[in-house]
Structure formats: C-alpha cells, structure tokens
Amino acid sequence: LNTTILTPNGNEDTTADFFLTTMPTDSLSVSTLPLPEVQCFVFNVEYMNCTWNSSSEPQPTNLTLHYWYKNSDNDKVQKCSHYLFSEEITSGCQLQKKEIHLYQTFVVQLQDPREPRRQATQMLKLQNLVIPWAPENLTLHKLSESQLELNWNNRFLNHCLEHLVQYRTDWDHSWTEQSVDYRHKFSLPSVDGQKRYTFRVRSRFNPLCGSAQHWSEWSHPIHWGSNTSKENPFLFALEA
C-alpha cells in the first residue's frame, strides 16, 4: 500500500510503501518513526515561525520544510528559505510578511532528506495562530473624583483584537480582570484614592478576524494612586 502527499492542487501524489503491509486492515497498525509536529505562530502578521522539536529525532537530523497554500494563487510549493536552528540542527522556519496569507489554508510538509519517504503534511488556519504584540502606551485619565479610564494602543488593526485588563491594589492578593472588546479602553467606576492601583493589558486576535487562542504578552504595568505624582492628577502615563 502506498502513502500519499497532498499536493497544492488538492490531488494526491503516490510516494512510497510506508505502512506495515497489514495496514489498514489491522486496526492497530503503526507507522514508521513519526516526524515531530510542526507548530506555527504568526507574530502580529509581521512574520511567522514554524518550529518543531528537533531533539525528538533519534539522531541529529536536519529536517527540511516545504509549504504552500491550498486552492490559491500561492499554491506553488515553496522551500523554506530561512531556517531556525537549535544546536546547529534545523528546528524551524521563519516566513516573512509577504509569504503570509492569513485566510488561505496553509499546508506545511516536514521531510527527512535522508529518507524522503518519511514525511508529514499538516494543514493550518493561520488566522487562528496570530499572536499580537503586547499593548503599548498605556495611559490613565481621571474622568471624575472616583472614576478612572485606561487607554492603550496596539500595533495592529484594532477591530481584530479583544483585550483582557487586569488590575489590583497593593492590598489585593490577586488580580481582578475584565474582558474588553475592540474599543481598547476600560473604565474603573469606583476608585479608592487611598490605594495604589496597578493595571496591565494583553490582547488576542479574536473573534472578528480570527479565532486565536493565544494571548499577547502582558503590557508593561501602569500605576495610579497614593504613590504616584501629585503634579497632574488628571493624566498618568506609562511607568516601565
């Protein structure tokens, strides 16, 4: 029995006799040594890293990566042009912005060049793998005697992101958190002027433009309260 590789036009190429000859009539046939899984993340839609655990190979092996986009103008098979290395062994591939097409099915194929029949083809939805940069330029405005408004910026299309704000006082043991939609502002209606508050924000590419599960890093924190400058009580900028 032969295995197949899904080619860019959606047809299959016959490659080799890869399984035990009992496959698939034997319900528990196991293939030859599997290749490591490839995990891809798109960083702020500026570049993408697709990585694998090179140490899972029984001996050091420079695995090769090819990719293409299914059913699109970009369906030509591409070789990785920028490998990432771990201890001088390939462990990933970096793709630049012009090579990223979020809303086309991304097909990535890992192969052992010493045994070309040993390959694995994965399919990925890149719009679910976007990780934005952390929010920046956090600012606090005092809207009234007891109300604060937190604002921030993202280096991305704002409507594509949702946010999570966390805040706490010096008296709190844990963070209070609040989800915020694409509007990237948050109001705290009741502030105790005797306490010092810390705020931080992270963002996620969800739900309008994708369904990413991974959040950005947390922003640098910003502080407000009894220890902050008394000079301008109406505007407090980011504290690194």
Epitope: T4, I5, Q39, R118, A120, T121, M123, K125
Partner: nanobody, 126 residues
C-alpha cells in the same frame, strides 16, 4: 492503545447521503488528530478530511462542500456526513487517529496516523 471501528457505510444512489461513524475504545480522543481516508479498488489511498483536536477541519478538494467532518468528544466518536454522493465516491472509508501535542495539528498525510480502523464500504450507484 486506540482501537477504531467505522460504521455507517452502505449502498446509496447518486445524490444521496450517508453518515459514517468512527467509534474509539481504549482512549479519549481529546488529544488526537483525526482523519478520514478512502481507497477505491485498484487506486491509492486518498485523503478525504481531517481535523485537529482544537477544532480546525480540512477537506480534500473533491469533497469540499459535500462532506462534513465532526467529532463528539463526550462519545469518543467522529463523524463524516456525506451529501450529494457521486459514483466516484465509491470506496472503502477508513478512520485514523494520531496522538498530537498541539491543538492545531491536523494531518493530511496518511503516514502521520498511528491508528487505523478496519474500514467501511461505501457504494454509490448511478
């Protein structure tokens, strides 16, 4: 060990529908990528559809828009709903499973799957 048992195959007229079932015993499917493949007489095994345990689903061009892959983790079962069946869909359909670390891993290559069922015959008459 994962054991996979397919069912739901049969004889159907062109334009008809069938729903294939793939039940697993021995392990939960919660961390497995799953796939459906088919093999017609005298032809190579062919990718039909696959999914990741994170919920991303993919299809071969030949079945896209007609077939729907789904899974019920509570029942440890995956399904392949096949509509608008054509004679060229006639084949033995196999379910396959691959343990994966990442929620986004979905395989279209048959050699990536460690576990296979015995298959269920689907025949579409014209």
């Amino acid at each position: 060990q994962v054991q996979l048992v397919e069912s739901g195959g049969g004889l159907v007229q062109a334009g008809g529908s069938l729903r294939l079932f793939c039940a697993t015993s021995g392990r939960t499917l919660s961390r497995y990528a799953m796939g459906w493949f088919r093999q017609a007489p005298g032809r190579e095994r062919e990718f039909v559809a696959c999914d990741s345990w994170g919920g991303d689903t993919f299809y071969a061009d030949s079945v896209k828009g007609r077939f729907t892959f789904s899974r019920d983790s509570a029942k440890n079962t995956v399904y392949l709903q096949m509509n608008s069946l054509q004679p060229e869909d006639t084949a033995v359909y196999y379910c396959a499973a691959a343990p994966t670390s990442f929620a986004t891993t979905a395989y279209s290559s048959s050699n990536s799957y460690a576990y296979w069922g015995q298959g269920t015959q689907v025949t579409v008459s014209s």
